[in-house]
């Protein structure tokens, strides 16, 4: 008796954060020899029988959760982890600042503050070079991001986004970059 089929992986290239009108490719990858794939957009009743979805120009309606599976014989694999495809640039960019300032001594504390003139209730902070939002794996959906006991690893370029919990896959443009220097 064969063991259970491994679940496929689903990734967005170059990134799952996609500016409006920019291209993105969703790719589902199962074990070698598999060629029957189903790629689904959740909460939309849609699916396609392809391992690859190329989106030449990102649109609002394409943002959302995606998942894929493959068929081997008459068996379906477990689904991939969900991929959250986010459209950015839907709203004006927020501003990102550091309190007390962008230069901080190692061992000190700093708070990164994301501010917007709109009534958004969700915020995400990204550090350049990191694939996921700051404080991975949990998203810090709040306007203030305290960093306690700063280390050299916190040095880098940060950007934040704002969005609404009612439309969690439609984000603002990124804030201007903030350079955090740890001395």
């Amino acid at each position: 008796q064969r063991g259970p089929l491994p679940k496929p992986s689903l990734q967005a290239l170059p990134s799952s954060l996609v500016p409006l009108e920019k291209p993105v490719t969703l790719r589902c990858q199962g074990p070698p020899g598999v060629d029957l794939y189903r790629l689904e957009k959740l909460s939309s009743s849609r699916y396609q029988d392809q391992a690859v979805l190329f989106i030449p120009a990102m649109k609002r309606h394409l943002a959302g959760r995606y998942r894929c599976s493959y068929q081997n014989g008459s068996l379906w694999s477990p689904p991939s982890d969900q991929l959250e495809l986010v459209a950015t640039g839907v709203f004006a960019k927020p501003s990102l600042s550091a309190q007390p300032g962008p230069a901080v001594s190692s061992g000190g504390d700093v708070t990164l503050q994301c501010q917007t003139r709109y009534g958004f209730d969700q915020f995400a902070l990204y550090k350049e070079g990191d694939p996921a939002p700051y404080k991975n794996p949990e998203r810090w959906y709040r306007a203030s991001f305290p960093i306690i006991t700063v280390t050299a690893a916190h040095s880098g370029t940060y950007r934040c986004y704002s969005f609404s919990s009612g439309d969690p896959y439609l984000w603002s443009a990124p804030s201007d970059p903030l350079e955090l220097m740890v001395t």
Partner: antibody, heavy 123, light 112 residues
Framework: QVQLVESGGGLVKPGGSLRLSCAAS????????MSWIRQAPGKGLEWVSS????????DYAASVKGRFTISRDNAKNSLYLQMNSLRAEDTAVYYC????????????????WGQGTLVTVSS | QSVLTQPPSVSGAPGQRVTISCTGS?????????VHWYQQLPGTAPKLLIY???NRPSGVPDRFSGSKSGTSASLAITGLQAEDEADYYC???????????FGGGTKLTVLG
């Protein structure tokens, strides 16, 4: 306009076989997933089987797996259901149904149904 | 035993509002799959009534509306009319074996 016409139903003895056909017209048949759905007398709807637009993806309900075979001929705009080892509980009206499609996407619902063909399994 | 659970029957007087519930699980409605509703008038084939939880195909009166929350969904019919007397079925998809699933159906009786 979209039309789905089932045929091939009738009276058959337990253990017997029957082949249902569904003739499609009024749309691009080869673009759509198709399904067979049945309804036993006085009962609810039960999905039986579906086949992908190119005939590659095929799924069956557990109750018919190994006994029924779905197929399609896109050149003839036709859907088929070969039913073997029939049982009394397979007695039902069998509907052919089209899955909605828009651009490259298929959808998980049925936008057009045929009028059905009655299959009676009885000795 | 249907995968989705509906009440066997509901009834209402002309002009009234009735709702029909459809309860699923974490492998179908709760797994991110939409709910669709079909109306089957006596002696006829089912007809698509609501798709994608709350959308009406052209020709379906706005007296019919649908909603979804968590692992369940509901169909509401306002301003009940005699011609609404029919069987109503909810349908979704199940992630486990990628099968299409239906509710057991609800018979709507318009009183009087």
């Amino acid at each position: 306009q979209v039309q789905l016409v089932e045929s091939g139903g009738g009276l058959v003895k337990p253990g017997g076989s029957l082949r249902l056909s569904c003739a499609a017209s009024g749309f691009s048949f080869s673009d759509h997933y198709m399904s067979w759905i049945r309804q036993a007398p006085g009962k609810g709807l039960e999905w039986v089987s579906s086949v992908g637009s190119e005939g590659k993806f095929i799924d069956y309900a557990a109750s018919v797996k190994g006994r029924f075979t779905i197929s399609r001929d896109n050149a003839k705009n036709s859907l088929y259901l070969q039913m073997n080892s029939l049982r009394a509980e397979d007695t039902a009206v069998y509907y052919c149904a089209r899955h909605y499609r828009e651009f490259r996407w298929h959808y998980y619902y049925f936008d057009y149904w045929g009028q059905g063909t009655l299959v009676t399994v009885s000795s | 035993q249907s995968v989705l659970t509906q009440p066997p029957s509901v009834s209402g007087a002309p002009g009234q509002r009735v709702t029909i519930s459809c309860t699923g699980s974490s492998s179908n409605i709760g797994a991110g799959y939409d709910v669709h509703w079909y109306q089957q008038l006596p002696g006829t084939a089912p007809k698509l009534l609501i798709y994608g939880n709350s959308n009406r195909p052209s020709g379906v009166p706005d007296r019919f509306s649908g909603s979804k929350s968590g692992t369940s969904a509901s169909l509401a019919i306002t301003g009940l009319q005699a011609e609404d007397e029919a069987d109503y079925y909810c349908q979704s998809h199940d992630l486990g074996a990628h099968v299409w699933v239906f509710g057991g159906g609800t018979k709507l009786t318009v009183l009087g």
